[in-house]
């Protein structure tokens, strides 16, 4: 399956926080989305192979890494001034 953690996270002002996303499905592609209240999902970053990733529509204030196939952590940086949202990780073949 695919596992995201933590379920809830509070960020202190000026802090970077990292959301974990792990999958054991042998999927090449992984994605991070953001959903704000009353809105649809918006793509932040995606990765299609290990050590390669591309910006989505709203990448500013976020960073990612893809050091291994199974993992695609998202860092919400201090530059992200409005981080409060629902974050969703996904993967696909």
């Amino acid at each position: 399956g695919i596992t995201q953690s933590p379920k809830y996270l509070f960020r202190k002002e000026g802090q970077n926080v990292t959301l974990s996303c792990e999958q054991n499905l042998n999927h090449d592609a992984m994605y991070w989305y953001r959903q704000d209240p009353g809105q649809g999902l918006r793509l932040i970053y995606y990765s299609q192979i290990v050590n390669d990733f591309q910006k989505g529509d709203i990448a500013e204030g976020y960073s990612v890494s893809r050091e291994k196939k199974e993992s695609f952590p998202l860092t919400v940086t201090s530059a992200q001034k409005n981080p409060t949202a629902f974050y969703l990780c996904a993967s696909s073949i």
């Epitope: 299609q48 290990v50 990733f53 890494s65 050091e67 291994k68 993992s71």
Partner: antibody, heavy 120, light 112 residues
Amino acid sequence: QVQLQESGPGLVKPSETLSLTCTVSGYSITSGYFWNWIRQFPGKGLEWIGYISYDGSNNYNPSLKSRVTISRDTSKNQFSLKLSSVTAADTAVYYCASPSPGTGYAVDYWGQGTTVTVSS
Amino acid sequence: DIQMTQSPSSLSASVGDRVTITCRSSQSLVHSNKNTYLHWYQQKPGKAPKLLIYKVSNRFSGVPSRFSGSGSGTDFTLTISSLQPEDFATYYCSQSTHVPFTFGQGTKLEIK
């Protein structure tokens, strides 16, 4: 900052096995990425030999596959190259290398290179 | 294997010149994920190659803006807009779309 350092004999006899080790500092080789061996012939041409992945899986150049083994020692954070049945054509500078974050498979962390001469 | 052919093999130029090196692959370098894994390296005597450009046109960290890459499919170029004394070196293209990863034969850039 990832640093790589090759070690091994500089002279190997024909038909013997070339053995080199790459010691990695600044990053655990089990944490991610691909750990490559690349060689450069005296005429300056570059050839990718193969890699060992963070999970221990391998990918080799088919032209060398029957003679090459890349393995690792996770306790020492090292990976190694063995090339059997060498000939003078295997004389080259051998580099260990790994990719820079986010560049696909483009490598930019390199060892200093070790010159291996095959001669009796 | 994918053959990577660079031209010219050697090139004489002066400081301030605009220089273009081309690289042609024997097959398309577009990956199934639609990215193109074509890279450019610079090598100076006695040193390991250094990454300049990755994925066709992305300048690597710390690489001066005078270096740029372009192209698609099978045809790619590295351009140095205004040569500096430290740019005289050998340049290699490389592909990592297909295994085995392969390199061009190199272009030696010399002072005129």
